[in-house]
Interface confidence: low
């Protein structure tokens, strides 16, 4: 059996335990919300909310300003004071539920759990490259708001998502809040509403449009709003909610709600079920057909995609795609598949599906039994009838009422289950060159930056590193500031470069120079780094070969040895074809002649493993001495590969030249029929890669080989006679004169 180089796991070319220190800010309490601002005059800021406090940070994460947002009723509460003399409601801590930018003004809007969920508007005042908050305006008009009708009650203590849209000269707040019976009874926040900010910043205009979970369903039907965003002509909310009003409320699924961003109306409110699955390449027995469902959305982000992923999704480069991380249930506990899966939903396809659903409901021929749905918001009805009505009246349109699209949008895990045990808790997607990168935070406080690509069976990591030592979960909301992303974990905010924190986790030159161009990695003699880390020796154009092992470890001083070298960066071409004169191997002083690669031995190597083999024929020079020596591989004049060219020398110790010695042979006679078990004793009999015992020129079949002993079975003899017996190692005869006598059987 030919000796084969041991496989090197792909993971051996990187080390995810390398420590990276990224800029951070300690907020003094659990981070509840975070948002960034970039002005058009190079000024920027990071706003970080914790319980009862709002921090303003500069682009370097240094504190610029801090504002007390609670407790309500406390004389030190700076935002409360903006609402005039109190009391304004029950005293209590302020947990920030909403922190958004109104880009039109520009201003920061914060809404908390206290004071009926009212909001405060903070004008932004640029000061050099930093930004300060002006005195807050209280977005609450006491005379406009009643417990049963409160346009200025925005935030729910159970959670609220807000997206701000400019329409004409006005700012509209698209608000989605989680409700229960207790919350709904106190100043009646709505499930979904569109509220116009009054020009004088005294609150929101009354008479706003809204949808709310019907009182009879409030106890059993809770909707969690996970994410909201605005793209094109629509605002989208992503929800996790019971799959049915009537069935088990713990059977959850994910929906996308779409609202018009151009008309502040809810007549064209649409919902679509998003179905994300893990569909392993080989389905386990008993696994559901179509894949294992991951119905619960944990985090989401929408972003334009790079060319490569766009091709995979059959959409144009730069088109917007909604990415979601899904889990099997609320606890996200382990099932048979991975803990987290990532599904991609192109926005254009979402819109097409929704529009087709509207056609199905409202266009002839009518599909009998097709429900309008959303029975938790409105009275049940069948298409094309409006909610609660048996028929369309002449002056109403089927299209002007909310609708749940009857078909779901199904996708499978982009990562093919490769996230495995990782529990993803944060997601932000960016486009770098033509690559689409998912920046993910995890339950154990790590950041994974991974290329989003479908067709591989391994993850393409930009980085995978720990944010700090606390190991606390990375929080859901991520913000971008310039070329950095801001992640929150525990009471800390971390600033992570979108290009990755560095290159030191790439351990080999080959892996280093194969890294994405945007990472700026280069090789610095023996480590991978960015140019600023090692300006002297940094280069991006070549890698030396790397010898990791060879076989055998010894060879005869006279005679040849077939030497197999193992390592990486020998060829750069999977075929292993070597141009003439590029590879020079020496063992001690002796050259080792490269052998052509035997294509019948080429084995497909899975990308998760890698190894390169190089074979050469070693014929020691006459001047070569017995004893230990080095194996040296030098590669020069190789044509460049896709990422770099191979150039340089690798040396490995541990080869020994030995002189085999034959001391004894027994028995010295045997039957002419052959089959006598010969024992040859000596030293260094197993060196090299070939040996042969010849009885009268015919090979004696070797049964066992060890350093001090060879066993072989004699071939048949032509006649009864004494014949020469010799041992060859590496094709050269071992000194000594021996005879074997064939006798009658």
């Amino acid at each position: 059996e030919d000796w084969q180089c041991p496989r090197t796991p792909y993971a051996a070319s990187r080390d995810f335990d390398v420590k990276y220190v990224v800029p951070s800010f300690s907020a003094g309490g659990l981070v509840q919300a975070m948002v960034t601002y970039e002005g058009d005059r190079n000024e920027s800021a990071v706003f970080v909310a914790i319980r009862n406090r709002l921090h303003v940070l500069g682009p370097d994460l240094k504190s610029v300003q801090s504002l007390a947002t609670g407790p309500a009723g406390d004389p030190g509460c700076q935002t409360c004071a903006a609402c005039g003399p109190g009391p304004h409601g029950p005293p209590g801590d302020t947990d920030t539920k909403v922190l958004v930018l109104d880009p039109a003004l520009p201003a920061l809007v914060s809404c908390g759990s206290s004071l009926q969920g009212r909001c405060f508007l903070h004008d932004l005042e640029p000061q050099g490259t930093a930004v300060h908050l002006a005195a807050p305006a209280c977005l609450f008009s006491a005379h406009h708001n009643r417990p049963d009708d409160c346009p200025d009650c925005v935030a729910s203590p159970l959670g609220t998502r807000v997206t701000v849209v400019e329409q004409g000269q006005a700012s509209y707040f698209y608000v989605a809040s989680s409700l229960d019976a207790a919350v709904a009874a106190s100043f009646s926040p709505r499930s979904v509403s569109i509220r116009r900010l009054k020009a004088d910043a005294s609150g929101f205009a009354p008479g706003f449009v809204a949808l709310s979970v019907l009182p009879k369903h409030l106890v059993s039907y809770s909707i969690e709003y996970v994410h909201s965003f605005h793209t094109g002509a629509f605002v989208y909310f992503l929800t996790v909610q019971p799959a049915s009003v009537t069935d088990d409320p713990s059977a959850l699924h994910t929906r996308l709600a779409r609202l018009s961003a151009t008309e502040p109306e809810l007549g064209d409110y649409r919902e679509l079920v998003l179905d994300c699955r893990f569909a392993p390449k080989r389905r386990r027995r008993g696994a559901p057909e179509g894949g294992q469902p991951y119905p619960v959305l944990r985090v989401a982000h929408s972003a334009p995609v790079g060319a490569q992923l766009a091709t995979e999704l059959s959409i144009a480069e730069g088109q917007e795609v909604l990415f979601g991380v899904f889990v099997t249930g609320k606890d996200g506990g382990p099932g048979v598949g991975p803990n987290s899966v990532v599904c991609a939903f192109p926005i254009d396809l979402l819109d097409t599906l929704i529009d087709e659903g509207v056609e199905r409901c409202c266009e002839s021929p009518v599909h009998p039994g097709l429900r309008r749905g959303l029975d938790f918001f409105q009275s049940p009805s069948f298409c094309p009838n409006p909610p609660g009505l048996e028929a369309l009246s002449p002056n109403t349109s089927c299209r002007h009422f909310p609708l749940l699209v009857s078909s779901s949008f199904s996708r499978v895990d982009l990562f093919n289950g490769l996230l495995g045990p990782v529990q993803v808790t944060a997601l932000y997607v960016t486009r770098l060159d033509n690559v689409t990168v998912a920046h993910m935070g995890t339950m154990d406080g790590r950041i994974l930056q991974v290329e989003l690509v479908r067709s591989l069976n391994y993850l393409l990591y930009v980085s995978n590193f720990s944010l700090g030592d606390s190991g606390q979960p990375v929080q859901r909301d991520v913000s971008r500031l310039g070329d950095h992303l801001l992640f929150a974990s525990g009471d800390q905010v971390f600033q992570v470069p979108i290009q990755g924190p560095g290159c030191r986790h790439f351990l080999t030159c080959g892996r280093c120079l194969r890294a994405w161009h945007f990472m700026g990695c280069g090789w610095c003699g023996n480590m991978c780094g960015q140019q600023k880390e090692c300006p002297g020796s940094w280069q991006q154009d070549h890698c030396p070969p790397k010898l990791t092992e060879f076989h055998p470890h010894s060879g005869p001083l006279r005679g040849s040895t077939r030497l197999t070298l193992c390592g990486s960066n020998f060829y750069l071409h999977p075929s292993g074809l070597v141009p003439e004169g590029t590879h020079q191997v020496t063992v001690g002083q002796s050259p080792c002649r490269p052998l052509p690669k035997d294509s019948s031995k080429l084995r497909p190597v899975p990308r998760k493993d890698f190894v390169e083999e190089f074979e050469c024929e070693l014929e020691p020079l006459g001047t070569q001495a017995v004893g230990p020596t080095n194996v040296s591989l030098t590669v020069t004049n190789m044509p460049p590969g896709k990422h770099f060219r191979v150039d340089g020398t690798s040396v490995l110790r541990g080869f020994s030249f030995m002189e085999p010695v034959l001391i004894a042979v027994q028995p010295l006679f045997g039957p002419r029929a052959g089959g006598t078990c010969l024992t040859l004793e000596g030293q260094s009999l197993s060196v090299g890669t070939s040996r042969a015992v010849l009885v009268n020129g015919t090979e004696c079949l070797l049964a066992r080989v060890s350093e001090g002993q060879l066993l072989c079975a004699t071939p048949p003899g032509a006649t009864v006679a004494s014949v020469p017996l010799s041992l060859q190692v590496g094709g050269a005869q071992v000194p000594g004169s021996w005879t074997f006598q064939y006798r009658e059987d």
Epitope: T311, S314, I315, S407, R454
Partner: antibody
Amino acid sequence: EVQLVESGGGLVQPGGSLRLSCAASGFTFSRHWMSWVRQAPGKGLEWVSEINPDSRTINYAPSVKGRFTISRDNAKNSLYLQMNSLRAEDTAVYYCARRVRIHYYGAMDSWGQGTTVTVSS
Amino acid sequence: DIQLTQSQSFVSTSVGDRVTVTCRASQNVGSSLVWYQQKPGKSPKTLIYSASFLYSGVPSRFSGSGSGTEFTLTISSVQPEDFADYFCQQYNNYPLTFGGGTKVEIK
């Protein structure tokens, strides 16, 4: 413009071998799954085999498994089908087709003009 | 293997008519179904994928519907260039399979 040009078809005896080639141009070949589909004279379409962009995932129709081998050379923008142990029922027009990359859809969106394989003694 | 049955081998119609071609799967294929058009001596052309999505460049008179096991291709107003063979194909399971085809011909 996407172009797929098949070649290598011809008349071959039962038990014989043939190698079909497909030259691709007008798109990034190395990013697409590629397929072979055949159509017997006067009959419908039959999927034969497919290969993913980096050749790590390959699927075959049961009728050709063990006899046909699909391969690709991304450097040459070429797709191949090595057909061994050919039978009379393998007689067909063989189309090279590109897979739609709308996420994971297995639809073919571009087809070559086809090359004819006739297996007859 | 999943069998796809196109029960009508031929559909005779006139220019301007609405025509439907059906395809039935022997087991649930979700929405993993595509429709192709093929003219004599030519290679197939993709019309609809994912059961109902119009492939780019295909006229809007073509539409697809259905999911699970029953699928329909509709041409709302047949044009002279639409007389051809139409095949469905599923890609929910391996092996990928095609329907036997339906020829839309001039009445």
